[in-house]
């Protein structure tokens, strides 16, 4: 069990495109036909103006046009829903594909894809029916951009909603070596395959993946829930051939300075094919990016039954020490480190800024708005709202609610 | 304020190996890495590796062979070292930094004022 | 690796002239692009990261826009500081890759 770990099967709720809580100053666009088709009528359901958002431009062959709704602060985006141009029933308007960027901090942007590197979603094929898209992997995103396509010059015209919830433990990026491949009798590839940072070399960094994405793997690490993936893919791996300092050191960056009472940490310890938990870990703690680390280092060593197969989460205390970098260097306890998921328990530091100090030029309006003094069940289970149920089978399925 | 300082020789000879020293102030290792580039009339800027701040290393294919990269964190030096250097290696030397964090991620910032290398007999 | 083809190698300017410099990736880099400056006997000054965002202290008059393989870079109001070589970078992935330079020059 990860405690104060995420439920992505409960992270489906309206965001507030379609219920107007997300307002027309966060719904903008690279251009619109007209003042009738502007971006603030791109809401899902919604008969406003001439129906939907439509770009001035051709979005053949360029694909340059988007529709972007700023979600003012971070969330998990489970899913998105499409639909055309209403017009009075009458809009013929639709975007039969379409592509997704997304950012945390609106200065890097990255394209979504699915787990194979698909990025083109399938889209409407008429003006009316609502396409939701179950979005595997997920993304932590601030913003997000509609990108429409189309296979030749016509018109397109949209309508969105986004779907998820808030990002709570407010992870920005971790920092990671290359997750490596095991050699079995088939190869198992323990690459964080969704990490949508920078790779450069034996490092990832800048971004998030697998170890932040809610699915915990399973007891046999070349399993996984997820249909039509490798072998290993739910596990980010590391052996310790590869590291002479015997551990691996990761680094976690937050939105803003917190208060860490624990580290979860949902490792797998099949220790007959050489995956074992860590033999302890140490974590350091620091407030800014160019700040030197604070205080002693906090130690946990990690006893317990290792010779139980199963996969589990380990919970490190991390003594409510105030950060917002994390550096936690994992012991190996046998040949290979395997994790699913890593997560933390925390509090927002009240009056915290996410731009602490002068220690770093500003981003162009970073960071985002101030947390609420508390988080109340509204901002995580809508009033009145039922989150949308998950498809059976593939969790990349397109389905109508027409 | 951040400085990156460079020091190493202007002449190396055909075979030799060339090392230069980038002394860091002003910020810490962590959550930075040092790359390396150069400059040359003919090949414009190469990139040629860089070091983590967690001492992980990585290195241009075309240089692997011959370039090590090293660090001691506690004096704030990162150690550039490139064997069998030829006059085709005749350049100018940079080292440069760049965050791993996203609220402090600029690209490379800040560089060393440079190493002008001249491999002559 | 990537390759970053930069056009044009040479412009000649006026003071006050609109200025458009272009890199092509020879693959996606996402919006993964730094411009730098460069002055005679300096070490390269960032101007541009993530395509599109100025850094600290940088005049307004510098630009960038693009993503995936086609990136621009261009100065609005060209004035004789500027006079310099200028280059295109991706760090998307390893190894980072710079484009070949654009040199402005006087007319």
């Known amino acids: 069990d990860m405690k104060g770990h995420f439920d992505p099967a409960k992270c489906r709720y309206a965001l507030g495109m379609q219920d107007r809580t997300i307002p027309d100053s966060d719904i903008s666009a690279s251009s619109s036909w007209s003042d009738s088709t502007a971006a603030r009528h791109s809401r899902l359901e919604s008969s406003d103006g001439d129906g939907a958002w439509c770009p001035a431009g051709s979005v053949f062959p360029k694909e340059e046009e988007y529709l972007q709704v700023d979600l003012q602060r971070l969330h998990l985006v489970a899913l998105v829903g499409t639909q055309g141009r209403h017009a009075g029933g009458l809009g013929k308007e639709f975007s039969r594909s379409y592509r997704l960027r997304y950012s945390r901090d609106g200065r890097r942007w990255m394209g979504w894809k699915d787990r194979w590197g698909q990025e083109v979603i399938s889209g409407n094929e008429d003006p009316e029916g609502v396409v939701l898209k179950d979005l595997g992997p997920p993304m932590v995103a601030r913003l997000v951009r509609f990108y429409p396509r189309a296979d030749r010059v016509m018109s397109v015209c949209l309508r969105v909603e986004l779907y998820g919830c808030l990002w709570r433990d407010g992870l920005l990026s971790y920092t990671a070596p290359v997750g490596q491949t095991m050699y079995l009798s088939e190869a198992v590839y323990l690459n964080d395959s969704t990490y949508d940072g920078h790779t450069v070399g034996g490092l990832q960094y800048g971004g998030l993946g697998q170890l932040a994405d809610g699915v915990v793997g399973l007891d046999d690490f070349r399993k996984s829930q997820e249909l039509r993936v490798w072998p290993g893919y739910d596990y980010v791996g590391w052996s310790n051939h590869s590291f002479s300092s015997g551990y691996v050191e990761m680094e976690f960056e937050f939105d803003r300075l917190r208060a860490f009472q624990a580290m979860q940490v949902h490792c797998n310890n099949m220790h007959t094919l050489g995956a074992r938990l860590p033999g302890g870990v140490e974590c350091r703690f620091r407030r800014g990016p160019a700040m030197a680390w604070e205080g002693e280092p906090m130690r946990h060593n990690l006893g317990g039954n290792l010779g139980d197969p199963r996969a589990r989460a380990v919970s490190v205390p991390l003594g409510g020490r105030v950060a917002r970098f994390l550096q936690c260097r994992f012991l190996f306890a046998g040949p290979w480190l395997l994790f699913s998921e890593i997560s933390f328990i925390s509090d927002v530091v009240n009056n915290s800024s996410p731009a602490l100090g002068g220690t770093f030029p500003p981003a162009p309006w970073w960071p985002p708005g101030p947390p609420p003094t508390n988080f109340s069940s509204l901002e995580l289970e809508p009033r009145g709202q039922q989150p949308v149920a998950k498809a059976e089978g593939s969790p990349t399925i397109e389905f109508r609610m027409d | 304020q951040v400085q990156l300082k460079q020091s190493g020789p202007g002449l190396v000879q055909p075979s030799q190996s060339l090392s230069i020293t980038c002394t860091v102030s002003?910020?810490?290792?962590?959550?930075?890495?040092i790359h390396w580039v150069r400059q040359s009339p003919g090949k414009g800027l190469e990139w040629l590796g860089v070091?983590?701040?967690?001492?992980?290393?990585d290195y241009n294919a075309a240089f692997i062979s011959r370039l090590s990269i090293s660090m001691d964190s506690s004096k704030g030096q990162v150690f550039f070292k490139m064997n069998s250097l030829q006059a085709n290696d005749t350049a100018i030397y940079y080292c440069?930094?760049?965050?791993?964090?996203?609220?402090?991620?600029?690209?490379?910032?800040?560089w060393g004022q440079g190493t002008s290398v001249t491999v002559s007999s | 690796s990537i390759v970053m083809t930069q056009t044009p190698k040479f412009l000649l300017v006026s003071a006050g002239d609109r200025v458009t410099i272009t890199c092509k990736a020879s693959q996606s880099v996402s919006n993964d692009v730094a411009w730098y400056q460069q002055k005679p006997g300096q070490s390269p000054k960032l101007l541009i990261y993530?395509?599109?965002n100025r850094y600290t202290g940088v005049p307004d008059r510098f630009t960038g826009s693009g993503y995936g393989t086609d990136f621009t870079f261009t100065i609005n109001t060209v004035q004789a500081e500027d006079l310099a070589v200028y280059f295109c970078q991706q760090d998307y992935t390893s190894p980072l890759t710079f484009g070949a330079g654009t040199k402005l020059e006087l007319k």
């Open positions: 070091i983590w701040s967690g001492g992980i290393t």
């Open positions: 002003g910020f810490s290792f962590t959550g930075y890495g």
């Open positions: 993530y395509a599109s």
């Open positions: 440069a930094r760049r965050s791993t964090t996203v609220v402090a991620d600029y690209a490379m910032d800040y």
